[in-house]
């Protein structure tokens, strides 16, 4: 399924600001980290991030006790997000705890830049993608994924963190954006809307899709997320739009069928390992790429975003399950958990394919207004 080219803007439904809880992969155990023989890490001791504040944001990390032989991130303070005046307020919010602005929400005060100045940065995410204005870059080769087909054991942690559903990924999932641009997957999470209201974070010519998956990666040049935050290319996110199709998506069903178990905010369950690559589109060669930020506080910039041109199809029932099962803080449904699109401010979105060609019925002739910045690669 190619991205539809919309002639007119679609109504944007939804929340306003931040990404979800993704990162925080604090100390990745290194290859040399031998567990202690007496009691090596157990099935549930997955290295990786706990509940972090933002998709792209970074916590301070504390190692777990030595006996468990494996490191986890602690819960990090999160910040509250501002509402988007043009959008309805999202009721999935967190209550304030005194003056401690340690939690963020979609559609609430205080404004994010007050808590994390980077949220007012010039190169933020998500953005609206206009294929006609994308720069065709032949140097952008097909993405390479290795180790994404996980065996059923060890099981993975699936958690409702109050602003998304997040699957913590084990070490060993390798992704390359190109030669020398290698990453390790940390976690994946989803963004969605509500009944009849789409909830993707990125848009295409103003069109918002029903939902969006983000797989968050840390550059192999860094051992910890907090080292990579704000560094160009330190983090990379693979993003794909989810659309309604006629059939049930069996890969997604392995996760969606477990959402009732984690309906309550802060709850989690263990799910068998699965083929993570099956959650993404099959065409790894056609995508858009740009440099942006985490979509939740701390909104750190330097994040490489790769948005697939091909979409993933879920059944109507599955999309309904996604948007209508989880609860956020208090008695509010976890819905419309997306940030409003941010201005490009001169950034050029690159495409791995000639996206301007046949991209919109409005264009009689293909126009490629921008040149590829990586042409010499």
């Amino acid at each position: 399924q190619r991205l539809p080219r919309m002639q007119e803007d679609s109504p944007l439904g939804g929340g306003s600001s931040g990404e979800d809880d993704p990162l925080g992969e604090e100390d990745l155990p290194s290859e040399e980290d031998s567990p202690r023989e007496e009691d090596p890490p157990g099935e549930e001791d997955l290295p990786g991030e706990e509940d972090l504040p933002g998709e792209e944001d970074l916590p301070e990390v504390k190692p777990k006790s030595e006996e468990e032989g494996s490191l986890k991130l602690e819960d990090l303070p999160t910040v509250e997000a501002p509402g988007d005046p043009q959008e309805p307020q999202n009721n999935a919010h967190r209550d304030k705890e005194g003056d401690d602005q340690s939690h963020w929400r979609y559609g609430g005060d205080p404004p994010w830049p007050r808590v994390s100045p980077a949220c007012a940065g010039r190169f933020q995410s998500p953005v609206d993608i206009r294929p006609q204005l994308a720069a065709f870059c032949p140097a952008l080769r097909p993405l390479e994924l290795l180790g994404f087909q996980l065996p059923p054991l060890p099981e993975l942690r699936l958690r409702n963190n109050g602003h998304s559903v997040q699957l913590t990924l084990p070490p060993g999932l390798e992704m390359a954006l190109g030669p020398g641009r290698e990453y390790r997957a940390l976690q994946l999470h989803l963004h969605w809307g509500a009944a009849g209201r789409p909830g993707s974070e990125h848009t295409v010519e103003g069109h918002r899709f029903p939902a969006e998956i983000h797989v968050v990666h840390l550059s192999t040049a860094f051992a910890r997320v907090d080292e990579a935050l704000g560094r160009p290319g330190g983090l990379a996110v693979l993003a794909a739009f989810l659309e309604e199709g006629p059939e049930e998506n069996s890969a997604y069903e392995q996760l969606l069928s477990r959402l009732e178990e984690i309906a309550e905010e802060g709850s989690e369950t263990q799910v068998p390992g699965l083929d993570i690559s099956a959650l993404l589109p099959s065409d790894f060669s056609r995508y858009f790429q740009y440099e942006g930020s985490l979509t939740t506080p701390p909104c750190a910039q330097g994040v490489i975003w790769t948005v697939f041109n091909q979409t993933v199809m879920l059944s109507a029932k599955q999309l309904h399950t996604l948007s209508d099962t989880l609860w956020g803080p208090g008695d509010s449904r976890l819905q419309l958990n997306f940030r409003a699109t941010q201005p490009l401010n001169g950034r050029v979105i690159e495409a791995s394919f000639p996206a301007g060609v046949d991209s919109s019925p409005r264009a009689a002739e293909p126009v490629q207004l921008n040149s590829c910045l990586a042409a010499g690669d």
Partner: antibody
Framework: QVQLVQSGGGLVQPGGSLRLSCAAS????????MSWVRQAPGKGLEWVSA????????YYADSVKGRFTISRDNSKNTLYLQMNSLRAEDTAVYYC??????????????WGQGTLVTVSS | QSVLTQPPSVSGAPGQRVTISCTGS?????????VHWYQQLPGTAPKLLIY???NRPSGVPDRFSGSKSGTSASLAITGLQAEDEADYYC????????????FGGGTKLTVL
């Protein structure tokens, strides 16, 4: 001391049943997936079955699916393998093994001493 | 026939270096899955020797090392000693099989 102590092997006729037990000590049993691995006389290792730490998920090799059942009692720190409709080709030393989670990959890091199951008429 | 292929036997004199190969395919080792190695001394249960391709559990001498490249892995033993005489097995996962845990057929190491 981390250890796995097995019991329950023996001689059984084809079509018969047997239950193997594996008592764990020295570690938090419920935090680990566990497996059964067997070794036919003079042959190599063959994975038989696995169970998640909570017991909620179970997995089997095709050769035993529908005949063997893996289970665990976390309150007793014990792993079980119920073997029904036994065949001559099931004759082997059966090992229980702990699945240590190293870098997100399960390795069999602690093994029981093994128990011989002989299926013969 | 095993999914992972190992030589049936290797041998070496004390003090020498020997390697044991473990060859798989794009659905197991080549798919990025870790390889683990086990040592089984005569009449005993297997023991974890190398985990995650090249990591030694505590207590395993540094004479043992592992590596992985493409669809193959190998176990190297330097400074061979008489007590190293045993069967060695590699283990990984295979995405194409319902029996997703796979072992090599085993290699008998003889110390001459």
């Amino acid at each position: 001391q981390v250890q796995l102590v097995q019991s329950g092997g023996g001689l059984v006729q084809p079509g018969g049943s047997l239950r193997l037990s594996c008592a764990a000590s020295g570690f938090t049993f419920s935090s680990y997936a566990m497996s059964w691995v067997r070794q036919a006389p003079g042959k190599g290792l063959e994975w038989v079955s696995a169970i998640s730490g909570s017991g909620g998920s179970t997995y089997y090799a095709d050769s035993v699916k529908g005949r063997f059942t893996i289970s665990r009692d976390n309150s007793k720190n014990t792993l079980y393998l119920q073997m029904n409709s036994l065949r001559a080709e099931d004759t082997a030393v059966y090992y229980c093994a702990r699945n240590g989670n190293y870098r997100g990959s399960l390795a069999f890091d602690i093994w029981g001493q093994g128990t011989l199951v002989t299926v013969s008429s | 026939q095993s999914v992972l292929t190992q030589p049936p036997s290797v041998s070496g004199a004390p003090g020498q270096r020997v390697t044991i190969s473990c060859t798989g395919s794009s659905s197991n080792i080549g798919a990025g899955y870790d390889v683990h190695w086990y040592q089984q001394l005569p009449g005993t249960a297997p023991k974890l020797l190398i985990y995650g391709n090249n990591n030694r559990p505590s207590g395993v001498p540094d004479r043992f090392s592992g590596s992985k490249s493409g669809t193959s892995a190998s176990l190297a033993i330097t400074g061979l000693q008489a007590e190293d005489e045993a069967d060695y097995y590699c283990q990984s996962y295979d995405s194409s099989l319902s029996a997703w845990v796979v072992f090599g057929g085993g290699t008998k190491l003889t110390v001459l």
